[in-house]
Interface confidence: low
Amino acid sequence: NQDLPVIKCVLINHKNNDSSVGKSSSYPMVSESPEDLGCALRPQSSGTVYEAAAVEVDVSASITLQVLVDAPGNISCLWVFKHSSLNCQPHFDLQNRGVVSMVILKMTETQAGEYLLFIQSEATNYTILFTVSIRNTLLYTLRRPYFRKMENQDALVCISESVPEPIVEWVLCDSQGESCKEESPAVVKKEEKVLHELFGTDIRCCARNELGRECTRLFTIDLNQTPQTTLPQLFLKVGEPLWIRCKAVHVNHGFGLTWELENKALEEGNYFEMSTYSTNRTMIRILFAFVSSVARNDTGYYTCSSSKHPSQSALVTIVEKGFINATNSSEDYEIDQYEEFCFSVRFKAYPQIRCTWTFSRKSFPCEQKGLDNGYSISKFCNHKHQPGEYIFHAENDDAQFTKMFTLNIRRKPQVLAEASASQASCFSDGYPLPSWTWKKCSDKSPNCTEEITEGVWNRKANRKVFGQWVSSSTLNMSEAIKGFLVKCCAYNSLGTSCETILLNSPGPFPFIQDN
């Protein structure tokens, strides 16, 4: 068929960059070279359907499905996935080819399936089918690292029982707070399993393989720091190892540290001490409390005491099963078009959660921040003022949690009109949902003030796009108004918008658009 455009379908794999967000064109990601997916015409299909080669993707990988169209003139398009239509923004490359992209960030089971792309060009309409599945990595695992004491040495070994064999690294920081963020210059990384330097402020061990990266922080009580307003809490599951480090600095060596559980001294073999002089000749002591495999009776208040510092405690809670505690009731928000607003979820969880924010089938990176009271918070601010339904999903090894949010953007209606031989219809978004009035323009009423009440049919929420409602109003044609100009107006608390239509004409006649 001579009219058919030349189509190229490609797959672009991205190296994940956690600050990236799914977009239809430019995105801040490092990309591998595109892989050609063929895109052959599907035989025996009704209509023109191109089929791309099947795409297999690793869990958590980020990809772009891209179509390059060599066809004259403009194109318009629509993506459909699992019966939901998704926005599509074609653009043109340097060779003047139409380019349409679909970014899938951090691939999950829910994002696997058939992606249909409908393209309308000046010459013809056609469909492109992509099938995306998750590569079978059932044998792959990535377990959170844990600590063991090295036999006959004052050193910690970091272990992660994962497949494929993970790369283990220690992440060390001697600063406080914000400057211990992963990419800060204060952070030092050591790609080794054994760590001898155990005096640092912040010590984490991380393991990474094809499935991602998991980290465990060495729980620390610092007797020189002001205690938190709420008691620090450490959760562990039965059978996991317990490690707590108590650290204290004093002007000289004349002080000692001890651990107690519920006012009883820890047994020999459940603690070990190390000490060193710092550069300014002060003495640093650390005392580790450890249990190789915790049981329910290891629950309680662990207190570190010093002969020269106020003692501090931590509550250790041993649970049978992991948990995620948060309120899952859905929340609705209504904001102005330029109002700064973030969704937020406060939760307590163990083990640490993996989470995503989702809007209109797009997944966005999810960041967690620990609060002083043992809770964590995840915020999502990148809604770009798009109304609709937003989903927060969190899971760990033992629990799942989902919370729904609805975002409504207050704005005055915008009216679109269309007319047929028998009726005129007006459509509007805007929030709160608008009410409608119809007016007739005639010699008697040149300002279109004569209200029409007969034959008007209003439908609220006739179309829901990602949770965004649209309202419509239809005027059935009668002899009394045939040939006249009529005006439909949508109004809400933020304003009114009108469109004028000439009845009996083949299409909308935007005589005036009043705002």
């Epitope: 967000v21 064109s25 330029y338 109002e339 607003f341 973030c342 937020s344 609060l371």
Partner: antibody, heavy 119, light 111 residues
């Protein structure tokens, strides 16, 4: 309409502390970050830090870390900036600013508070 | 931190002329497909006033003669035809990442 009203000018001795207040009105206080920016006489603008009043989460400029504390009182819609261990080079006009993240279309600033550090 | 360098430090022009102010970032201020670069005007004794946000979007009530362009690391503020009230100091401010940073300012003075 949105208003940010700051406390009056202060004269302080070196080594002391100053606490400047910024009372917000005309908008939902917890929906916007509040920034603090200072400007020494004849100099440029310098960002000190910010607070999210909804959960009191703060970010500070490392240059001031340890000396600056930003707080917010939701009940009175007031943000505070406290600067300790004052030195003569801290003499400046201190502004609070309600500033959105990407949609900065409407950002509002207080009238400024002059803090003079002098022995 | 992201360092912003403005040029020129001083620009001497007459009313009616076109002004072009430049701001260069030490690394890209783009994220989520948005350039987190903003331009402010400050007159003596006054708080700064937002002119342009997200590199090219106009702030509320800003005259059309002020426009912004650029992405990544290079940004420009253009005043198409200078009015007497436009002579002031102009700052660029990046809001991509903490610490938010300002340029050192460009003084626009009457020739």
């Amino acid at each position: 309409q949105v208003q940010l009203v700051q406390s009056g000018a202060e004269v302080k001795k070196p080594g002391s502390s100053v606490k400047v207040s910024c009372k917000a009105s005309g908008y939902t206080f917890t929906s916007y970050w509040m920034h603090w920016v200072r400007q020494a006489p004849g100099q440029g603008l310098e960002w000190m830090g910010e607070i999210d009043p909804s959960d009191s989460y703060t970010n500070y400029n490392q240059k001031f870390k340890g000396r600056v504390t930003i707080t917010a009182d939701e009940s009175t819609s007031t943000a505070y900036m406290e600067l300790s261990s004052l030195r003569s080079e801290d003499t400046a006009v201190y502004y609070c600013a309600r500033s959105a993240y990407y949609s900065k279309r409407d950002d509002y600033w207080g009238q400024g508070t002059l803090v003079t550090v002098s022995s | 931190e992201i360092v912003l360098t403005q040029s020129p430090a001083t620009l001497s022009l007459s009313p009616g002329e076109r002004a072009t102010l430049s701001c260069r970032a030490s690394e890209s201020v783009d994220n989520y497909g948005i350039s987190f670069m903003n331009w402010y005007q400050q007159k003596p004794g006054q708080a700064p006033r937002l002119l342009i946000y997200a590199a090219s979007e106009q702030g509320s009530g800003i005259p059309a003669r002020f426009s912004g362009s650029g992405s990544g690391t290079d940004f420009t503020l253009t005043i198409s035809s200078l009015e007497p009230e436009d002579f002031a100091v102009y700052y660029c401010w990046q809001s991509k990442e903490v610490p938010w940073t300002f340029g050192q300012g460009t003084k626009l003075e009457i020739k």
